[in-house]
């Protein structure tokens, strides 16, 4: 681990209560193909333990969704990945709207610091799929 | 190669016969910008030769497609990437539907083992583009 | 830097004049979370300084966009990432159309050589968002 190869791939555990837009994640071989090697989970949110530049990636699929599902709703469904704590470093890193689609997927490189907690906020009232091949979230340390 | 930097980027060769949903891939500098450095192709399917955690990525674009093309058809067009052999390790790793779009693209981290063969199944009856900048599939070893 | 860990993550600076479909990028900690560590910018275009296989990724979101925005226009809005110079190596690496969506995001592995300049061409007449969490472009050296 001293190489700094911190890496994690998480699967969706559950959504938050009504006023909490955060997705709650889980990881570990017992759960399937998810894992945490370096980063850790704090109440379902991913916390970074090593400074560096990370590749952050995510895919979220809406449950029992058709192309009309997303257009039926008045409020757009949007997924944002950001640093939510510490508050001094709070920032949105990656944001996507579903529009007439049922899946969003993206990735980006970003500097993260030890202690940064990443939150994935799903706004709107559509439930995400918990299928492990449809909804997942991961980070990979790529360099100091 | 002893560093374990196994890596491959493939381009679409052809689709399978009617009852075979698999896409058949090809790779090599003579074909363009595709390559195999470590992994190998077995009848158009990608076989892993080194254990580790891999970043798997894919983009598939449907041929001569407009936003109405995908909604014309009764059956949804879906792309699934999975381990198809050995049978004991068969699992879907990544799944996306086209809905009213013409391209899907995603990526994920997943543990793979030597001998795992990855299949990319395109269900539905729409022909994928063979343009090398529109349809491609790759893996990158990222850590043990 | 001798490890060859060249890496860059850029944010959108501006679009080109009317007949120039290229997006112009900027990077640096003073601008936010964008950075250049190895590659460099030449008039807003990304130039590679080290040979190798790179993971290229991009996300582009159209400004003030709804799912009807993209279908309103006669000409499709398409994003292409390619090597634009030197002319002898000019090629399209990655191409996506927006169709009825407002965001495209993808990634691929590709060999790049020192001196290759990457261009991101946005065809159509829709303005991209300059929000740093909605539109970004990056490369990561992954192996020789």
């Amino acid at each position: 681990e001293s190489l700094g190869w911190d890496i994690a791939e998480l699967q969706l555990n559950h959504t938050g209560p009504q006023q909490d837009p955060r997705l709650y994640w889980q990881g570990g071989p017992a759960l399937g193909r998810s894992f945490l090697r370096g980063p850790e989970l704090d109440k379902g949110q991913l916390r970074i333990r090593r400074d560096g530049i990370y590749m952050v990636h995510i895919q979220v699929t809406l449950a029992i969704c058709s192309s009309t599902s997303t257009s039926r709703h008045h409020h757009p469904t949007t997924l944002a990945v950001g640093i939510c704590s510490p508050a001094s470093r709070s920032i949105s890193l990656l944001r996507l709207s579903f529009h007439q689609g049922c899946t969003i997927a993206s990735q980006r490189l970003t500097p993260l610091a030890r202690g940064d907690t990443l939150c994935t906020n799903l706004t709107g009232t559509l439930l995400p799929s918990r299928n492990t091949d449809e909804t997942f979230f991961g980070v990979q340390w790529v360099r100091p | 190669e002893s560093l374990g930097w196994d890596i491959a980027e493939l381009q679409l060769n052809h689709t399978g016969p009617q009852q075979d949903p698999r896409l058949y891939w090809q790779g090599g500098p003579a074909l363009g910008r595709s390559f195999l450095r470590g992994p190998e192709l077995d009848k158009g399917q990608l076989r892993i030769r080194r254990d580790g955690i891999y970043m798997v990525h894919i983009q598939v674009t449907l041929a001569i497609c407009s936003s109405t093309s995908t909604s014309r058809h009764h059956h949804p067009t879906t792309l699934a990437v999975g381990i198809c052999s050995p049978a004991s390790r068969s699992i879907s790793l990544l799944r996306l539907s086209f809905h009213q779009g013409c391209t899907i693209a995603s990526q994920r981290l997943t543990p793979l083992a030597r001998g795992d063969t990855l299949c990319t199944n395109l269900t539905g009856t729409l022909l994928p583009s063979r343009n090398t900048d529109e349809t491609f599939f790759g893996v990158q070893w990222v850590r043990p | 830097e001798s490890l060859g860990w060249d890496i860059a993550e850029l944010q959108l600076n501006h679009t080109g004049p009317q007949q120039d479909p290229r997006l112009y990028w900027q990077g640096g900690p003073a601008l936010g979370r964008s950075f250049l560590r190895g590659p460099e910018l030449d008039k807003g275009q990304l130039r590679i300084r080290r040979d190798g296989i790179y993971m290229v990724h991009i996300q582009v979101t159209l400004a003030i966009c709804s799912s009807t925005s993209t279908s309103r226009h006669h000409h499709p809005t398409t994003l292409a990432v390619g090597i634009c110079s030197p002319a002898s190596r000019s090629i399209s690496l990655l191409r996506l159309s927006f169709h009825q969506g407002c965001t495209i995001a993808s990634q691929r592995l590709t060999p790049l050589a020192r001196g290759d300049t990457l261009c991101t061409n946005l065809t159509g007449t829709l303005l991209p968002s300059r929000n740093t969490d909605e539109t970004f472009f990056g490369v990561q050296w992954v192996r020789p």
Epitope: - | L12, Q18, T61, L62, A63, I64, C65, T68, S69, S71, R72, H73, H74, H75, G124, T125, L126, L127, S129, R130, N131, T132, E134, T135 | -
Partner: antibody, heavy 120, light 111 residues
Amino acid sequence: QVQLKQSGPGLVQPSQSLSITCTVSGFSLTSYGIHWVRQSPGKGLEWLGVIWSGGSTDFNAAFISRLSISKDNSKSQVFFKVISLQANDTAIYYCGRNSYYGNLYAMDYWGQGTSVTVSS
Amino acid sequence: DIVLTQSPTSLAVSLGQRATISCRASKSVSASGYSFMHWYQQKPGQPPKLLIYLASNLESGVPARFSGSGSGTDFTLNIHPVEEEDAATYYCQHSRELPLTFGAGTKLELK
């Protein structure tokens, strides 16, 4: 085996409408699109329109105002109608199954054809 | 609309020889790594029969003496060796965009 059988009148009065039914067997209309093509000595083969497995339609712009295509999946029937026929609409009308790939737009099986004469 | 021009309009070929039919499109019908050109055979009193799809792919059940080639705007159907049952009219059809259009046909007769 795959079959497409057409039924419809052979003679139509000018300004009247033409209705043809294409009844299919050996496959489901929820999986395949059905094209309509006509053939006349003067104009050769002309593509008229298609109804897709999902029920949506595409038409040749030259006929869009006169043409309708619908279907009943449960009865495996496709209904084709042209209004305001004139003498130059005299032709053999065919239904044809879209090939396996939905975006290929080639016809791999055809009906036997309905010979239509427009005359008073 | 894309116009397809077939040549020749008719040809006579001896049994066992090669028949070559050309189809030229008014603009490219190649896209997405494919050529969206198809070939049909039609005998009197019968509907057309699909022979070749995507320029060079043989439809199931069609004899291997039929072959297709070409890309962009220029396409060719070859029959070799020609057999008696090949006497028919041959049509090209594109599917690059709507509307689909057909060539005017080439009538193949046996000498």
